[in-house]
Interface confidence: low
């Protein structure tokens, strides 16, 4: 039989909690084996004091018997031929020799029934507090600060941590981020970064990245000073920030122990984030103006935000929804956050001019309206903050109310009317459609433009397929022309002001279908961009190619 | 107002799967940890598993372990229990909880519940 | 597993005390007032009470049971009451609850 106890001496510090273990081998008997401990005092070396028994509920001296009661000095088993006991505070009495013994179940003494050792208590000199965050300055006060840094920008603080225990004993200083009002100590005390007794730093779960990133430092400063940088504060940073210090020291089986933990707040950290700042407005109010005049709105971005810079930077669009129109609408212009401009989809060919004004003032401008252009606009402002490195990530985005913006209508209407020349047409001829059109309303210098399309029945039915674009002419004169069915010649032309032809020369039988007009009505602004002002579709125009008598 | 909004429940077949959707509004998910509870009837509240604020520490409740899958989206505010190889016993109305701390793991520490979607699993 | 009673009764304006022994440092209570329904947080983290919850409630802690108190019991207050604590293995737990009868 042999009993096993950890090498000694064991070096503990006062108040805080030990364990030592002790386990049994080659015993007989049950597997489930009893353990007595006993405490041998430096002042009574040969005296005993009954400490706690696995068997014997009565078994503590009286020194011992209310702290076993209450709890604090326990015997727990971890198997039948193992136990440790626990003491929770330990008390500068409590050093000197530890017998682990056990009774007997073998049929003959052999080997050793008891193990031995020597536990010496440490005084409690492990002191925490919380340092200015320079390398030098006055102690902090004796309350926790209360600090507010915005989103973005820089989170330092510092810690004083120190020990004068006589042994040879390593700290590890670790700081901590608790949610507000949260216990000092809970299970919810999140680690940022520590630095290990071997110097080594490392972070917590979330916060690993930002470390390996570089945007979350520790150094220690000196002998007892420790430094925690926390660059691009985020939402998620704010709470109650602690440190903790815990001194280790090496038992003689060459295993670490921990033996004192002391911990302080530091501040209490308000992060002001730039959602909860950000703030858009826009003017004049309600526009109403006529086509070809220039609209131009203002866009305002206010809060108690940092200036774009290092830590920030903003970007500001506006985006258009037609009346009527769910959603925020598409984009018309931006400025980024390196303050280049930029026209969104279906605005470039534009005379617009997106441009900063005044420090947090932009301005949209559009050189001539059209009545597309009427809808509700909002400015749109983004705030980033540059990350690690320089790498911005977007913290907030805030949009204007809408601004309504009426533009009149032309108040144009057309009407078309088309045909086929002759009635009746046979392959191998030409077929000659024509299109009359009528114009009411519109401003002076209004252009017509008109194009052919055709839909082709299949299996006898007119397909699903979209129309398909024949020819046409532009507003601009300039003959377009697109894809015939028969494949041959095609040609498109204006045979008086409001009257347009389209000719399909030699007709085949692939060139049978139902014809249709589009015009369109268009008028040219001060900036030389057109805009279409109306439309209208002509009724159905039916080619059918027939097959001459002597055709085989 | 903080809000949770369970949705996913309904009529599933043993052997199969469901995935169970919690929708926070009025409150950044990302700084709690959110759980999972469910009560079949007439019994009491049943822990069924917990996910950290960051996701990378979950727990599950030893009925469900090997089954279920806790999971979110901070940026969409969401949580989902995913829980496969349905069984009767796992009737009931299920509550999405959020606590008040983050990585805590603990049914101590909850400070609001969803209204609950009802789960029945039946052939 | 967390112990508490099955069943206390009380008079109207009496006080109650619901009690769960467990092994963690940590519980909370919920009141439903029918199966199916919400639960509702009375408190959390031993003695934390929310904003919206009457000062009637409060709970305590000593040792390893955690107690709730209600004084001035009202007839509304008739409800399940559970207990919630996390186990040895940090996995959530709730009591069976206890049903509130009032007289």
């Known amino acids: 039989r042999e009993v096993l106890v950890p090498e000694g001496p064991l070096y503990r510090v006062a108040g805080t909690a030990v364990s030592i273990s002790c386990n049994v081998t080659g015993y007989e008997g049950p597997a489930q084996q009893n353990f007595e401990w006993f405490l041998y005092r430096p002042e009574a070396p040969d005296t005993a004091l009954g400490i706690v028994s696995t068997k014997d509920t009565q078994f503590s001296y009286a020194v011992f018997k209310s702290r076993v009661v209450a709890g604090e000095v326990q015997v727990q088993r971890l198997q039948g031929d193992a136990v440790v006991l626990k003491i929770a505070r330990l008390q500068a009495q409590d050093a000197g020799i530890y017998e682990c013994h056990t009774p007997s179940t073998d049929t003959r003494y052999l080997g050793s029934y008891s193990g031995k050792v020597e536990l010496r208590v440490l005084p409690d000199v492990l002191q925490v507090s919380a340092a200015p965050p320079g390398p030098r300055g006055r102690q902090a006060p004796t309350s926790p600060p209360r600090m507010t840094v915005h989103e973005g920008q820089e989170l330092a603080l510092g810690c004083l941590a120190r020990t004068s225990t006589q042994k040879h004993t390593h700290l590890a200083v670790s700081f901590g981020r608790s949610v507000p009002e949260a216990p000092v100590g809970r299970s919810t005390l999140q680690e940022v970064v520590g630095i290990r007794s071997d110097l080594a730093v490392e972070a917590g779960a979330p916060y690993a990245e930002r470390l390996a990133a570089g945007e979350l430092r520790l150094g220690k400063e000196g002998t007892d000073r420790y430094r925690m940088v926390v660059g691009g504060a985020q939402a998620g940073d704010a709470g109650t920030y602690h440190c903790t210090a815990a001194e280790w020291i090496q038992d003689p089986d060459g295993s670490w122990a921990q033996i004192a933990e002391k911990r302080a707040v530091l501040a209490h950290v308000d992060v002001q984030t730039l959602s909860s700042q950000l703030a858009v407005t826009v003017g004049p109010g309600e526009r109403r103006i006529g086509p070809g005049e220039p609209l131009e709105l203002l866009c305002n971005v206010s809060g108690a935000l940092p200036p774009a810079g290092r830590h920030a930077a903003y970007s500001v669009g506006w985006e258009m929804a037609p009346a009527g129109a769910p959603g925020p609408g598409r984009l018309v212009a931006q400025l980024d956050t390196e303050g280049v401009g930029s026209l969104g989809p279906g605005y470039e060919g534009r005379h617009i001019a997106m441009e900063k004004v005044a420090s947090r003032t932009y301005r949209l401008r559009l050189e001539a309206a059209r009545p597309g252009d009427a809808g509700t606009y909002r400015c749109l402002a983004k705030a980033y903050v540059r990350g690690s490195g320089t790498r911005l990530r977007e913290a907030a985005s805030a949009r204007s109310r809408p601004l309504p913006v009426h533009v009149r209508e032309e108040g144009v209407v057309l009407e078309a009317v088309a045909w086929l020349a002759g009635g009746t047409v046979y392959r191998g001829e030409t077929a000659s459609l024509l299109c009359n059109i009528s114009v009411r309303g519109g401003p002076p210098g209004l252009r017509l433009a008109a194009s052919w399309w055709v839909e082709r029945p299949e299996d006898g039915e007119l397909s699903s397929v979209p129309a398909q674009l024949v020819g046409g002419v532009g507003q601009d004169g300039v003959a377009e022309l697109g894809v015939r069915p028969g494949g041959g010649p095609v040609s498109v032309e204006l045979v008086g002001p409001r009257s347009h032809r389209l000719r399909l020369h030699s007709l085949g039988p692939e060139d049978e279908g139902v014809y249709h007009c589009a015009p369109s009505a268009w008028v040219q602004h001060a900036d030389y961009s057109w805009y279409q002002a109306g439309s209208a579709r002509s009724g159905p125009v039916t080619v059918y190619p027939y097959m001459h008598a002597l055709d085989t | 107002a903080v809000t949770l909004d369970e949705s996913g429940g309904g009529l599933q077949t043993p052997g199969g799967g469901l995935s169970l959707v919690c929708k926070a509004s009025g409150f950044s998910i990302s700084s709690y940890e959110m759980q999972w509870v469910r009560q079949a009837p007439g019994k009491g509240l049943e822990w069924v598993a917990g996910i950290d604020d960051d996701g990378s520490s979950r727990a599950y409740a030893p009925a469900v372990k090997g089954r279920a899958t806790i999971s979110r989206d901070n940026g969409q505010s969401t949580v989902r229990l995913q829980l496969n190889n349905l069984r009767a016993e796992d009737t009931g109305t299920y509550y999405c909880?959020?606590?008040?701390?983050?990585?805590?793991?603990?049914?101590?520490?909850?400070?609001?519940w969803g209204h609950g979607t009802e789960v029945i699993v039946s052939s | 597993a967390l112990t508490q009673p099955s069943s206390v009764s009380a008079n109207p304006g009496e006080t109650v005390k619901i009690t769960c022994s467990g092994d963690?440092?940590?519980y909370g209570w919920y009141q439903q007032k029918s199966p199916g329904s919400a639960p509702v947080t009375l408190i959390?983290?031993?003695?934390k009470r929310p904003s919206d919850i009457p000062s009637r409630f409060s709970g305590s802690k000593s040792g390893s049971t955690g107690t709730l108190t209600i004084t001035g019991v009202q007839a509304d207050d008739e409800a399940v009451y559970f207990c919630g604590s996390r186990d040895s293995s940090y996995a959530g737990i709730f009591g069976a609850g206890t049903t509130l009868t009032v007289l």
């Open positions: 963690d440092r940590w």
């Open positions: 959390y983290s031993n003695d």
């Open positions: 909880a959020k606590t008040i701390y983050a990585a805590t793991l603990n049914a101590g520490e909850i400070d609001a």
